[in-house]
């Protein structure tokens, strides 16, 4: 029917914008479209340098730089709450000239029974209550309004949604006589979107729902629901996309099985299975239909929920994610790594890489780390010579490019970037590791030896001598 939103499978482009767009209000800058780079493809670096130089020279003229902070707004609908019944909320920094909105979901694990929720309440209360939230937050990484720190979307409207529901953004139950805690993660997102519509989101062209760790999983669980909500509220033209950072977990076999006692040693499948019941968790409808009743926990795992999603989603995941290793009971303490553990770690990277093979928009460096997109130095890591902001820019272009009915990637603008080398930090652009005792930065070779990887074993599959490999790694190749 006329005006009905047509949801797109990931990797497909949105319909071209209508020819007659409403004229911007007087004094409002026109939102720019991605540039057509075809004419300058050969000399892209020099062109980008000129654009950056121009942006930086114009930047001091704007009022944007006067206040870097995002300001706290507690929800007006106080029935949508954090775990302890205090109102949920969001931090906002408006960018009036932009029709791009970035909504970021914070991470911070979860709790799945009264005991570990009580303990969390007495240790990490800011993740369960808004009572002590600061009035402002500084935007970092992808939430920064500085073009130097955020070359991707520095001019967007920035929204940081604090995580205070402990339910991987999936819960839909309120506090009551029976329930000591409210778990309203899914409802918090819906309510934030509803309130933002009155603050300018109604005029948005693109809404990017992003998140890290539990927030990254929250993106996968909520992105289609946000798109459906906007459509139902009469905003079918807002393109909803997802950016899931460090939230793509595997329900693999733990290195050492432990009983489900606390949050970080409980096998993820068991923790989520218990959590869903405790939180009254909701999962994407299309995914839920693929599994039997009681098996909804499957939808918390990226590789299972992703094929059911309609909105385009970009997946960012370290191949050796620290949270994944933690729930798998792998604890790297600098003691020599036994062969069984080394093979387990390498296999984890291989399995994760395999789950991303059909994810057209992905960035997966072979590093041992956790979370990236709101780190100040999120621009530093590269996969196959491409940084994450650049890959996201290419993703934007691929979604905007209306003649992209063919699946061929844009020339010189890759979006599927998954490291193929097989061990932690084999990518020389990985975040630096420091030696615990000296505080000195370690290069990749030092790090691998520090972890107990035998250089002979590491070099052999590459068809190299240990000395050759050490030389290559020390040179950052």
């Amino acid at each position: 029917s006329e005006g009905r939103k047509t949801w797109r499978r990931r990797g497909q482009q949105p319909p071209p914008p209508p020819r007659t767009e409403a004229a911007p209000a007087a004094g409002q800058p026109v939102e720019s479209f991605p540039l057509d780079f075809t004419a300058v493809e050969g000399n892209m670096d020099s062109f980008m340098a000129q654009v950056k130089s121009l942006a930086q020279s114009l930047y001091p003229c704007s009022a944007q730089q006067l206040n870097e902070d995002l300001r706290l707004h507690l929800l007006l609908n106080t029935s949508v709450t954090c775990n302890d019944g205090s109102p949920a909320g969001y931090y906002l920094k408006e960018s009036r000239g932009s029709r791009r909105w970035l909504l970021f979901l914070e991470g911070g694990w979860y709790c799945f029974n009264r005991e570990n929720c009580d303990s969390r309440y007495d240790t990490m209360r800011r993740l369960m209550s808004s009572r002590d939230w600061p009035r402002t937050r500084t935007g970092t990484g992808i939430l920064s309004s500085q073009p130097e720190e955020n070359p991707y979307w520095w001019n967007a409207n920035m929204v940081f949604i604090p995580y205070c529901s402990s339910d991987v953004w999936s819960g839909a139950s309120s506090k009551s006589e029976k329930n000591e805690y409210a778990f309203m993660g899914a409802l918090i997102i819906q309510e934030v979107v509803r309130e933002l519509l009155g603050r300018g989101l109604s005029g948005a062209k693109v809404l990017l729902l992003a998140g890290s760790a539990a927030g990254g999983t929250g993106v996968l669980l909520n992105v289609d629901r946000v798109a459906e909500q906007l459509e139902k509220l009469g905003y079918p033209a807002i393109q909803v996309r997802g950016l899931a950072d460090s939230g793509w977990f595997l329900d693999n076999k733990q290195y050492r099985h432990t009983d489900c006692v606390d949050t970080i040693t409980c096998a993820p499948t068991e923790a989520i299975r218990r959590g869903i019941r405790y939180w009254n968790g909701v999962v994407p409808e299309r995914c839920r239909r693929q599994f039997q009743e009681g098996e909804e926990w499957n939808c918390f795992f990226g590789y299972k929920v992703y094929p059911t999603l309609r909105c385009p989603v970009f997946v960012v995941q370290w191949l050796f994610d620290e949270a994944q290793l933690t729930v798998d009971n792998v604890h790297l303490t600098g003691q020599p790594v036994q062969e069984g553990l080394r093979l387990y770690i390498q296999n984890l990277g291989r399995e994760l890489r395999h789950t991303l093979k059909d994810v057209p928009a992905s960035f997966a460096p072979a590093c041992l780390s956790h979370e990236i997109i709101i780190r100040s130095h999120w621009t530093d890591v590269q996969v196959k010579g491409t940084s994450l902001p650049r890959a996201l820019h290419c993703w934007d272009r691929s979604l905007h490019d209306s003649h992209k009915a063919s699946k061929t990637p844009l020339k010189g603008c890759p979006v599927h970037l998954v490291d193929s080398c097989p061990w932690p930090h084999c990518n020389p652009s990985c975040p630096t590791v420091r030696d615990q005792f000296t505080g000195q930065e370690m290069n990749v070779a030092q790090f691998l030896m520090h972890m107990g990887f035998d250089m002979q074993t590491v070099a052999q599959p590459q068809g190299l001598e240990p000395s050759e490999l050490l030389g290559m790694l020390s040179n950052g190749s």
Partner: antibody, heavy 119, light 111 residues
């Protein structure tokens, strides 16, 4: 002034019982999870027990489970540790401590009360 | 339980020099930008005193010569310049899960 003061320590025979108390003042007691720790002579710090801010959840170290009971009275701003079936290895200085709810560190400690288990 | 390995067990530092104490956890104690590791000072006959919380935050009233750093599993307490009154035993403690555990302590002696 924010303060914790322990009392109730003393000399007791093996198999005997003792009840320690910790009086809190200068802060909203009901907002904080509370812990008991102990330190044997010339030894390090050992965690003993925890009670959540609302008393719903309690945890014990394996070494005291089934013998010690932690409780609190938020109306009276007091924390207690009932110790039974005492052993010589329970001899230590016992401290109560306030756990900060945004970090889980112990920012306020009592001065301690000595428990000696000896025949 | 998370085991905290503190090193060295004791150290002697000259007045005005730097003292560095390390603490390694058997599991990652950081999440969502916070590292749940803390440092305490204890003098004979006194209860422990909080110095540094959440890896790097100085407790109010603690001199700025104390600083903490680290994330994941590896953490460090630095004291610089060391003063006479810093002679004490220092403990690290995590609060990532129950039970909270402490390192075995580092005894600092001033030369």
């Amino acid at each position: 002034e924010v303060q914790l003061v322990e009392s109730g320590g003393g000399l007791v025979k093996p198999g005997g019982s003792l009840k320690l108390s910790c009086a809190a003042s200068g802060f909203t007691f009901s907002d904080y999870g509370m812990h008991w720790f102990r330190q044997a002579p010339e030894k390090g710090l050992e965690w003993v027990a925890y009670i959540s801010s609302g008393s719903r959840t309690v945890y014990y170290a394996d070494t005291v489970k089934g013998r010690f009971t932690i409780s609190r009275d938020n109306a009276k701003n007091t924390l207690s540790l009932q110790m039974t079936s005492l052993r010589s290895e329970d001899t230590a200085m016992y401290y109560c401590a306030r756990k900060h709810y945004n970090g889980g560190y112990f920012d306020v400690w009592g001065t301690g009360t000595t428990v000696t288990v000896s025949s | 339980d998370i085991v905290l390995t503190q090193s060295p067990a004791s150290l002697a530092v000259s007045l005005g020099q730097r003292a560095t104490i390390s603490c390694r956890a058997s599991k990652i104690v950081s999440t969502s930008g916070y590292s749940y590791m803390h440092w305490y000072q204890q003098k004979p006959g006194q209860p422990p005193k909080l110095l540094i919380y959440l890896a790097s935050n100085l407790e109010s009233g603690v001199p700025a010569r104390f600083s903490g750093s680290g994330s994941g599993t590896d953490f460090t307490l630095n004291i610089h310049p060391v003063e006479e009154e810093d002679a004490a035993t220092y403990y690290c403690q995590h609060s990532r899960e129950l039970p909270p555990t402490f390192g075995s302590g580092t005894k600092l002696e001033i030369k």
